[in-house]
């Protein structure tokens, strides 16, 4: 089939980095500057992605592959192929309409991205709190209270609400 197709369609012989130029009797022409074709047989070359603003160039465009972007410091990539950049926050914070805000009591965020999420409720698994949670770290659950040897005690902080709320603006 491929052989038949190449006999019928001269464009199928054009390799990556070229395009089948209809204006020049279907000759394989190199992609113009700032464009590429990553597969053979293409009738046009695609425009190279430009990494501008909060995007920076991770890999330059070539005649056979698109440019790749990442984000400038203080931002992180979102989307397939880093199609978006979003502002970083500090650990223990989340991004809101008013910028980076500290996690509310009973919630934490151990990354510079994402949202504050509730501490693990150790008692749901029949365990006790071994290490208290903070804005940056989840609680650490230990053995169940019944498993503790006599005289031993576990840290018992105020239990966060089952569904921690957020303080008003």
């Amino acid at each position: 089939f491929e052989r038949t197709r190449s006999l019928q369609d001269p464009c199928s012989n054009c390799p990556a980095g070229t395009f089948c130029d209809n204006n020049r009797n279907q000759i394989c022409s190199p992609c113009p500057p700032n464009s590429f074709s990553s597969a053979g047989g293409q009738r046009t070359c695609d425009i190279c992605r430009q990494c501008k603003g909060v995007f920076r160039t991770r890999k330059e465009c070539s005649s056979t592959s698109n440019a790749e972007c990442d984000c400038t410091p203080g931002f992180h990539c979102l989307g397939a192929g880093c199609s978006m950049c979003e502002q970083d926050c500090k650990q223990g914070q989340e991004l809101t309409k008013k910028g980076c805000k500290d996690c509310c009591f009973g919630t934490f965020n151990d990354q510079k991205r994402g949202i504050c999420r509730p501490w693990t409720n150790c008692s749901l698994d029949g365990k006790s709190v071994l290490v208290n949670g903070t804005k940056e770290r989840d609680v650490v659950c230990g053995p169940s209270p019944a498993d503790l040897s006599p005289g031993a005690s576990s840290v018992t902080p105020p239990a966060p609400a089952r569904e921690p709320g957020h303080s008003p603006q």
């Epitope: 994402g114 949202i115 709320g165």
Partner: antibody, heavy 117, light 108 residues
């Protein structure tokens, strides 16, 4: 770049358990993202089912929580959905998606699951 | 009853401007994300954050918000913009997600 692909056994009978898997390619499921399931009944809107982190931590839609289990297999770079005691109302296109700060930035193409006897 | 409310349908003449709204308490604190979905296809993110577009999304799509209402505006609507549009944000818990009911945009 990251791509997601849902797969499952096809039609499910009422009262049985629906099982779907989402394969992650072009990136690691152990990245700093959460991995979600979203469904869409025919002709209706999107409904978030739940999500999982590579550590196994999960959050579920309260309306489905009693029937949903989401699990992760980091060695296979995939995560799975189980929905028990299904009825015709669970007939939907099921999507897996990557979630980051509430933004579903990468989606699978979706798979239709029909619940019918 | 969704925690994010959208009008079910709007229509717009080709080349004109259309505005879709999304209301919900969580939008006082957090931005909505907006998704476009065409028949038989998966949703595609078109706006996130205050007014940010993923690369490849035309600049005729923009967002704004006021209080508990987020808006998506298509300025100079094209035939290919005919689709369902969904807003999304957090639910009351603050750490789970919810979608609006969707708005069907018809380009006349």
């Amino acid at each position: 770049q990251v791509q997601l692909q849902e797969s499952g056994p096809g039609p499910v009978k009422p009262s049985e358990t629906l099982s779907l898997t989402c394969a992650v390619s072009g990136g690691s499921i152990s990245s700093s993202h959460w991995w979600s399931w979203v469904r869409q009944p025919p002709g209706k809107g999107l409904e978030w089912i739940g999500e999982i982190y590579h550590s196994g931590r999960t959050y579920y839609n309260p309306s489905l929580k009693s029937r949903v289990t989401i699990s992760v297999d980091t060695s296979r770079n995939q995560f799975s959905l189980k929905l028990s005691s299904v009825t015709a109302a669970d007939t939907a296109v099921y999507y897996c998606a990557r979630e980051d700060g509430g933004i579903m930035d990468v989606w699978g193409q979706g798979t239709l699951v029909t619940v019918s006897s | 009853s969704s925690e994010l409310t959208q009008d079910p349908a709007v229509s717009v003449a080709l080349g004109q401007t259309v505005r879709i709204t999304c209301q919900g308490d969580s939008l006082r604190r957090f931005y909505a994300s907006w998704y476009q979905q065409k028949p038989g296809q998966a949703p595609v993110l078109v706006i996130y954050g205050k007014n940010n577009r993923p690369s490849g999304i035309p600049d005729r799509f923009s967002a704004s918000d006021s209080g508990n209402t987020a808006s998506l505006t298509i300025t100079g609507a094209q035939a290919e913009d005919e689709a369902d549009y969904y807003c999304s944000s957090r639910d009351r818990s603050g750490y789970r997600w919810v979608f609006g009911g969707g708005t069907k945009v018809t380009v006349l």
